[in-house]
Interface confidence: low
Amino acid sequence: MAVTACQGLGFVVSLIGIAGIIAATCMDQWSTQDLYNNPVTAVFNYQGLWRSCVRESSGFTECRGYFTLLGLPAMLQAVRALMIVGIVLGAIGLLVSIFALKCIRIGSMEDSAKANMTLTSGIMFIVSGLCAIAGVSVFANMLVTNFWMSTANMYTGMGGMVQTVQTRYTFGAALFVGWVAGGLTLIGGVMMCIACRGLAPEETNYKAVSYHASGHSVAYKPGGFKASTGFGSNTKNKKIYDGGARTEDEVQSYPSKHDYV
């Protein structure tokens, strides 16, 4: 009963987590304009993995996709890749775990097969969660780096040298959604792995008891699982979305006259 509950709860938690990862990936508010120095601004800029938006005080919002692929920074591409890999692994994990659920009977599926499937889906959820957490963390690291690098810069404006302060971007809602969702998926995966230990065929348990009466009965021992994000901290001063293909009908995020779309 406890195994079924653990497995079911792991599935539900992972499902919520993966839904959150999908939501975070699609959200536009990965980075939002820092309003610390300008709280009453008429225009508010925010950016996602796929497009950049501006919202006017009237409530009018306009978004534009990043029309270039090659021009986008490698780190942004890496974040996109991590999130997509997380979603794909999570989706496959969900599919596998549905068939692995103890409460669902599919033909004459062996308990050992269910145990293996539960473990497989659990590992997939763990990797999916780690991908999402890594992706969000890499993006957050880019933001932190750029935030402190955004000091006053000189550039030529309409006819003369103009002193401007670059817009600073801070953490958007999508980052928090991504972290929480990745964490939930990770927890769900761990729960699935734990549940798989109690899903071994019953005769194995009896044999374990009869042959090792004085010892602990261990029905199923999954191999050790070690996951690593493989990402170090990004210390390069790399502006987000720099070097994108610019078009003549783009106007820029506050306060630069050049948009990175």
Epitope: V54, E62, Y155, T164, E248, D249, S253, K257
Partner: antibody, heavy 118, light 112 residues
Framework: QVQLVQSGAEVKRPGASVKVSCRVS????????MYWVRQAPGKGLEWMGG????????IYAQKFQGRVTMTEDTSTGTAYMELSSLKSEDTAVYYC???????????WGQGTPVTVSS | DIVMTQTPLSSPVTLGQPASISCRSS???????????LSWLQQRPGQPPRLLIY???KRFSGVPDRFSGSGAGTDFTLKISRVEAEDVGVYYC?????????FGQGTKVEIK
């Protein structure tokens, strides 16, 4: 809300210059691209020039090349349009208009009437 | 330069009736980014112009839904479903696909 406030009416002699100002409030001038448009009495709109974010420079309409200069002073949030060698045909209402982010003409100044008369 | 041609130049309409203005460009307004930068401006008597429609069919904030834009490539239309007294003025189409920006000659909408 973004507001553009232009300087008052001007009366000039032929051959003189006029400098029209356009003060931006509610947002930082450097975030906007400023366009200048004029409208002669009873006529349509005519684009004079403005900032092109792709090239990072101000583009002037061929008709006004060499006679018009567009500048901005970010410390005061004011854009300027100076038209020299005025002729009677330059009598018009001069407007500043912004292009904010993705599209043109979001906000307009109230217009500055310039009369060129001897 | 892209030439914008509007028809009709004058449109007398009855209050509550629909009105339609056409705009044709001398070349396609489809930008390399896939967008079509065609806007419609309204200029009421004694006032500066204001943005009504941008990117062919998107209404700017505060614009009543009786205004709609349509078209593609080189042919565009502004429609007013039911003309109201406050709609009197001159309407301009303008392209934002390339520099220099160019305007149509304007269409005067007046009440019969």
């Amino acid at each position: 809300q973004v507001q553009l406030v232009q300087s008052g009416a001007e009366v000039k002699r032929p051959g003189a210059s006029v400098k029209v100002s356009c003060r931006v409030s509610g947002y930082t001038l450097t975030a906007l691209s400023m366009y200048w448009v004029r409208q002669a009495p009873g006529k349509g709109l005519e684009w004079m020039g403005g900032f092109d974010p792709e090239d990072g420079e101000t583009i002037y309409a061929q008709k006004f090349q060499g006679r018009v200069t567009m500048t901005e002073d970010t410390s005061t949030g004011t854009a300027y349009m100076e038209l020299s060698s005025l002729k009677s045909e330059d009598t018009a209402v001069y407007y500043c208009a912004t292009r904010l982010r993705y599209f043109d003409w979001n906000y307009w100044g109230q217009g500055t009437p310039v009369t060129v008369s001897s | 330069d892209i030439v914008m041609t509007q028809t009709p130049l004058s449109s007398p309409v009855t209050l509550g009736q629909p009105a339609s203005i056409s705009c044709r460009s001398s070349q396609s307004l489809v930008h390399s980014d896939g967008n079509t930068y065609l806007s419609w401006l309204q200029q009421r008597p004694g006032q500066p112009p204001r943005l009504l429609i941008y990117k062919v069919s998107k209404r700017f904030s505060g614009v009543p839904d009786r205004f709609s834009g349509s078209g593609a490539g080189t042919d565009f239309t502004l429609k007013i479903s039911r003309v109201e007294a406050e709609d009197v003025g001159v309407y301009y189409c303008t392209q934002g696909t390339q520099f220099p920006r160019t305007f149509g000659q304007g269409t005067k909408v007046e009440i019969k």
